[in-house]
């Protein structure tokens, strides 16, 4: 591990290198100071690659509830409202960090976990494979 | 608060109710068992609302590197490669959890933080405000 510059006011840790188990304060600090009115709240309906949001709940995970996007169509919606199958609606995915209770049901012990979530959809030109 | 169902193998916690400070194992478990070759890797170029990825680094944050999307155009790219300004490229944003070193520089003490990141862009029909 790499030693991090230590602040003398830090809690003690046996391993002075990068620790495997750390203390985390769950009082979430929100860095998004103001509510952004331009946030994606209605993009899922107005997009040319619209999506539905599906609720996923797991009480052993922090956060317990995650809303995931699923593209409505294989193609993209044209100005006339019809679907153009020469284009593709695809999910934009992101790896996010969550906390997993470990051991199960423990209120104060977690393991960091990376999961892949679909955040929304975008319209892309398909990759055409030409046969020789 | 509500006490959580306790597993007898849980580490001790002074407060038997919902803890504010918890133990987190930083050995990340990756639930995305297989690397999905269809991941959004090249969507940023093929999308009708293409985006660039900007690196954001903060050594006081875990993860310290986050890649953010910025839409390339105000409008959306048409089949002929020109930009249609009757449509809008907009960022799809998501609130994600990160760990912030607290106190600063501490290797083993963090606070949970929520930040808003742009994951990619999508093409939407604009909201037209009609003047009476």
């Amino acid at each position: 591990g790499i030693a991090i510059p230590r602040n003398s006011g830090c809690p003690n840790s046996e391993d002075k290198n990068f620790p495997r188990t750390v203390m985390v304060n769950l009082n979430i600090h929100n860095r998004n100071t103001s509510t952004n009115p331009k946030r994606s709240s209605d993009y899922y309906n107005r997009s040319t690659s619209p999506w539905n949001l599906h609720r996923n709940e797991d009480p052993e995970r922090y956060p317990s509830v995650i809303w995931e996007a699923k593209c409505r169509h294989l193609g993209c919606v044209k100005a006339d409202g019809n679907v153009d199958y020469h284009m593709n609606s695809v999910p934009i995915q992101q790896e996010i960090l969550v906390l997993r209770r470990e051991p199960r049901h423990c209120p104060n012990s977690f393991r960091l976990e990376k999961i892949l979530v679909s955040v929304g959809c975008t319209c892309v030109t398909p990759i055409v494979h030409h046969v020789a | 608060g509500i006490a959580i169902p306790r597993n007898s193998g849980c580490p001790n916690s002074e407060d038997k109710n919902f803890p504010r400070t918890v133990m987190v194992n930083l050995n990340i478990h990756n639930r995305n068992t297989s690397t999905n070759p269809k991941r959004s890797s090249d969507y940023y170029n093929r999308s009708t609302s293409p985006w660039n990825l900007h690196r954001n680094e903060d050594p006081e944050r875990y993860p310290s590197v986050i890649w953010e999307a910025k839409c390339r155009h105000l409008g959306c790219v048409k089949a002929d490669g020109n930009v249609d300004y009757h449509m809008n490229s907009v960022p799809i944003q998501q609130e994600i959890l990160v760990l912030r070193r607290e106190p600063r520089h501490c290797p083993n003490s963090f606070r949970l933080e929520k930040i808003l990141v742009s994951v990619g862009c999508t093409c939407v029909t604009p909201i037209v405000h009609h003047v009476a």
Epitope: L26, I28, N30, T35, S40, S41, D42, Y44, L53, H54, R55, E57, P59, Y62, P63, S64, V65, I66, W67 | G1, I2, I4, P5, F18, E95
Partner: antibody, heavy 121, light 106 residues
């Protein structure tokens, strides 16, 4: 302190629509979902569905598909439920309640005072 | 959908008496919540995740159970406990409530 302030009682005609509101205060609006519950005159409780103010996502009890539309406005910290094609069966008290997305063991921990809807010609 | 059946529908107890009500689910569920409601007021979260008391709930209350069988017990009935208690599951959609057990004081 946490409050879910619901709109006032409604007396409406059959076949019409009504929109109920639920204004949240005293907590971070996007950290919680808003769930809607119907309580019939016989005191039966029914879960109508949920809306997530952060993503705009909604999930309905299939029984209320086409009947209830759930939305939320982050800027005004208000959740809405529109009830359509009202009949006498829709006469009830409707509650909004919040649900913490990060730790689901909290359950529906705060409830609004309820909005009474009476459908009558 | 999962049907929750509460019994008894109505019961009465003397102050100091032990009271037990049950909630039976038509399919196995992971956790049960209980809500208390008094006439003219909104329901209040009472017990969640089967056995965990909400803040402010007296310790004379307890919850237990697993699978398809759950119960709420008042160890020593008090006047203020007279109310209707509803069980609720969130293991599968749609979420459902039991029909309620009305507890009266003798």
């Amino acid at each position: 302190q946490v409050q879910l302030q619901q709109s006032g009682a409604e007396l409406v005609r059959p076949g019409t629509s009504v929109t109920l509101s639920c204004k949240a205060s005293g907590y971070r609006f996007t950290d919680y979902e808003i769930h809607w519950i119907k309580q019939t005159p016989a005191q039966v409780l029914e879960w109508i569905g949920v809306t997530d103010p952060e993503s705009g996502g909604t999930l309905h009890n299939p029984k209320f598909d086409g009947k209830a539309t759930l939305t939320a406005d982050k800027s005004s910290r208000t959740a809405y439920m529109e009830l359509r094609s009202l009949t006498s069966e829709d006469s009830a008290v409707y509650y909004c309640t919040r649900y913490y997305k990060y730790e689901s063991f909290y359950g529906m921990d705060y409830w609004g005072q309820g909005t009474s809807v009476t459908v009558s010609s | 959908q999962i049907v929750l059946t509460q019994s008894p529908a109505i019961m009465s107890a003397f102050p100091g008496e032990k009271v037990t009500m049950t909630c039976s689910a038509s399919s196995s569920i992971s956790y049960m919540c209980w809500y208390q409601q008094k006439p003219g007021t909104s329901p209040k979260r009472w017990i969640c995740d089967t056995s965990k008391l909400a803040s402010g709930v007296p310790v004379r209350f307890s919850g237990s159970g697993s699978g398809t069988s759950y119960s709420l017990t008042i160890n020593s009935m008090e006047t203020e406990d007279a109310a209707t208690y509803y069980c609720q599951q969130r293991s599968s959609y749609p979420w459902t409530f039991g029909g309620g057990t009305k507890v009266e004081i003798k």
